[in-house]
């Protein structure tokens, strides 16, 4: 009766035919070939590599789009039956119409069916465009990815290659260490046996020293003796030459008796003409006792009295109070003038303090009190100092106000521990504070990192130990 | 040997006062600066307070400043530590300790616990 | 808050060498003599290298104390399980008038 069927013609399209009596009529629906199914193979020349993070969120957009033509396939389907069975009704209609009816209701059918067909095309062909969209930011996304990992695949090859460089460079390290540690375990050895061998040295020199002790203790005795037989002969003499000078004045009045000059500082030798640097005789104020010292008669005008000078390790500041008190070691190289005859020299007039210092760079400065003096022992030879200019620092590394003075076996500092122990030498120690420049010589080398050594904070800093320096006072009305 | 022993320990209230002994022999006393340390529990070693051999010079760490005095007997051979408004966080053991000459401490006593609590 | 700043805690195997470094300043660890301390679990702390480097009589040689600028160290050749202590620098600070000691450093044989 009727026919309908459904087929494929050669270019793909699906053929819906309706079969009426001797009337045959075709209908050609477009067929989307664009879109792929999920079970079709997807094939891109893209690298594979693992997915952006959005690449999950794509896949669930394409079954999103996967189930839409699904339901659009299930919707064409419906259509057919539909289609099918209007026919049937129309196929009756048909029968009892004229033909010429039967043509007009075929193609508003076939118009329906076309406009349906063309709606549903067009919605198909948007949401293609936007697979299209997608399936391509989607292999760029791919790409990116895969230029990126082969950029850290090349990276981890360049790190594994160096690390392989840095164990053969470790390894090779390794064994020179090893080979070090052998070598410093010989040597080790070889100092422990210098060692034992210096103990055997130091005990047999301990024995010498005793030994020469007992000849200075008999040749200080004979030095006594042999001073005493000298200062008799002295005296002879001085009666003998004043016998013959009274003797001679009374044969010839015009020679006149020499008097005896006494100098109290080197300001007082330069004003009386000797202008040369070297040693000369001082005599206490209200005294006869008598000091050596050194006199400046070049710098800055001359006459300074050099009253502390370190150059060279040559003496140990390590120095009892007594010792600090008469003043100890060469005039002529490092020596400490002594504490009572600066104290009693600078408290007769106003003296200036001038302290020059030398490092181990070839540098030197300087610091300039305009003001100084000592108080007595009774008060531990506290310093006072007024006036400081220089180059060696604007703030003065002796600690102001001034502190007493420190000796090992006399502790007069600020501080809980004994500066003078720990630091070395008699100084005016604060707590324990930034100078001492009767510190641990330090030779060239081994001069930083020294808690100990000739210390000028405020010009080198805490650790570091100075090559030379000298202390001189002169008259401020110079 | 050098032996010190610390006593005065134990449990006050915050605001009150304890004064530490520490009683020091086999060494010349007067030769030597001493020192009161303290470690309050799980916690590192604080350095509280020391006199010079000669007692001339003390000091003390600046959170004890003002409430705690340091002195010495040295007839007694004897060290001691006033502490007066005292914390919760005072609570910690005290250690008295020799310091020779270059701020070392050589010996150390077996310590005394001392707990600030209400 | 110490003036002394230590690791607050180091390891290693025995026969490892380990360094505590003590770090400070010129008016401290510049100026003055370091000393380290070691202290064993619930007991009193005990003097173990003085005035930088200088150790006591009865302490190994395999510590070994030194000191570059305002930084001091403390190295421990050859571990042994009885060296798992408390370890502090210590020095006399011209600035606070007093007596500083460092954070403290746990030293763990493994």
């Known amino acids: 009766y009727n026919n309908f069927r459904k087929s494929m013609d050669s270019i793909g399209k699906k053929q819906y035919q309706v079969q009426h009596g001797s009337c045959s009529y075709t209908f050609l629906l477009p067929e989307m070939d664009n879109c792929r199914s999920s079970s079709s193979p997807y094939v891109s020349n893209a690298v594979q590599r693992d997915a952006p993070l959005e690449y999950d969120d794509s896949v669930q957009r394409l079954q999103v789009l996967e189930n839409i033509m699904e339901n659009n396939t299930q919707w064409l389907m419906k259509l057919e039956n539909y289609i099918q069975d209007n026919m049937k009704k129309e196929m009756v209609e048909i029968q009892q119409n004229a033909v010429q009816n039967q043509t007009a209701v075929m193609i508003e059918i076939g118009t329906n069916l076309l406009n349906q067909t063309a709606e549903q095309t067009r919605k198909l062909t948007d949401v293609e465009a936007q697979v299209l969209n997608q399936t391509t930011r989607l292999e760029l996304q791919l790409l990116e990815h895969s230029l990126s990992t082969n950029k850290l695949e090349k990276q981890i090859l360049d790190q594994t290659s160096e690390i392989n460089k840095l164990q053969d460079k470790n390894s090779f390290l390794e064994k020179k260490v090893l080979a070090m540690e052998d070598k410093h375990i010989i040597q080790l050895q070889s100092i422990k046996e210098e060692k034992d061998q210096l103990q055997v040295l130091v005990s047999k020199q301990n024995s010498i020293i005793e030994e020469l002790e007992k000849k200075i203790v008999t040749a200080t005795v004979n030095n006594s003796v042999l001073q005493k037989q000298q200062h008799d002969l002295m005296e002879t003499v001085n009666n003998l030459l004043t016998m013959m000078s009274t003797s001679n004045s009374a044969k010839d009045p015009t020679v006149a008796k020499e008097e005896q000059i006494s100098f109290r500082d080197c300001a007082e030798v330069f004003k009386s003409g000797h202008t040369t640097n070297g040693i000369y005789t001082l005599t206490f104020p209200n005294s006869t006792e008598e000091i050596k010292a050194y006199c400046d008669m070049e710098a800055g005008g001359g006459g300074w009295t050099i009253i502390q000078r370190r150059e060279d390790g040559s003496v140990d500041f390590q120095r009892t109070w007594k010792e600090y008190k008469v003043g100890f070691g060469n005039p002529s190289g490092e020596y400490w003038l002594g504490n009572e005859f600066v104290s009693q020299l600078t408290n007769q007039q106003r003296y200036v303090l001038k302290i020059h210092l030398k490092d181990w760079e070839g540098n030197e400065a300087y610091s300039l009190y305009e003001h100084f003096y000592l108080s007595s022992e009774e008060l531990n030879y506290r310093i006072h100092l007024k006036g400081l200019t220089g180059t060696a620092g604007k703030i003065s590394s002796i600690s102001q106000p001034g502190n007493d003075f420190s000796t090992k076996d006399g502790d007069n500092d600020k501080c809980i521990c004994k500066c003078s122990q720990m630091l070395t030498g008699g100084w005016w120690f604060d707590a324990c504070g930034p100078s001492n420049l009767n510190g641990m010589y330090y030779p060239q080398r081994q001069n930083t990192n020294k808690f100990n050594g000739i210390k000028w904070y405020y010009w080198k800093g805490s650790g570091y130990s100075l090559k030379a320096t000298t202390m001189m006072i002169r008259p401020a009305d110079f | 040997q050098v032996q010190l022993v610390e006593s005065g320990g134990g449990l006050v209230q915050p605001g009150r006062s304890l004064r530490l002994s520490c009683a020091a022999s086999?060494?010349?006393?007067?030769?030597?600066?001493m020192h009161w340390v303290r470690q309050a529990p799980g916690k590192g070693l604080e350095w509280v307070s020391g006199?010079?051999?000669?007692?001339?010079?003390?000091a003390y760490a600046d959170s004890v400043k003002g409430r705690f005095s340091i002195s010495r007997d040295d007839a007694k051979n004897s060290l001691y530590l006033q502490m007066n408004s005292l914390r919760a966080e005072d609570t910690a053991v005290y250690y008295c300790?020799?310091?020779?000459?270059?701020?070392?401490?050589?010996?150390w006593g077996q310590g005394t616990l001392i707990t600030v609590s209400s | 808050q110490s003036a002394l700043t230590q690791p607050p805690s180091l390891s290693a195997t025995p026969g490892q060498r380990v360094t505590i470094s003590c770090s400070g300043s010129?008016?401290?660890?510049?100026?003055?003599?370091v000393n380290w301390y070691q202290q064993v679990p619930g007991a009193a702390p005990k003097l173990l290298m003085y005035?930088?480097?200088k150790r006591p009589s009865g302490v190994p040689d395999r510590f070994f104390g030194s000191k570059s600028g305002t930084s001091a160290s403390l190295a421990i050749s050859g571990l042994q399980s009885e060296d798992e202590a408390d370890y502090y620098c210590?020095?006399?600070?011209?600035?606070?008038?007093?007596?500083?000691f460092g954070t403290g450093t746990k030293v763990t044989v493994l």
């Open positions: 005035t930088d480097y």
């Open positions: 300790a020799r310091d020779p000459a270059y701020s070392q401490f050589d010996y």
């Open positions: 010129s008016s401290n660890v510049g100026g003055y003599p």
């Open positions: 006199i010079s051999g000669n007692s001339k010079n003390v």
């Open positions: 086999g060494f010349t006393f007067d030769d030597c600066a």
């Open positions: 210590a020095t006399w600070d011209d600035n606070l008038n007093g007596y500083v």
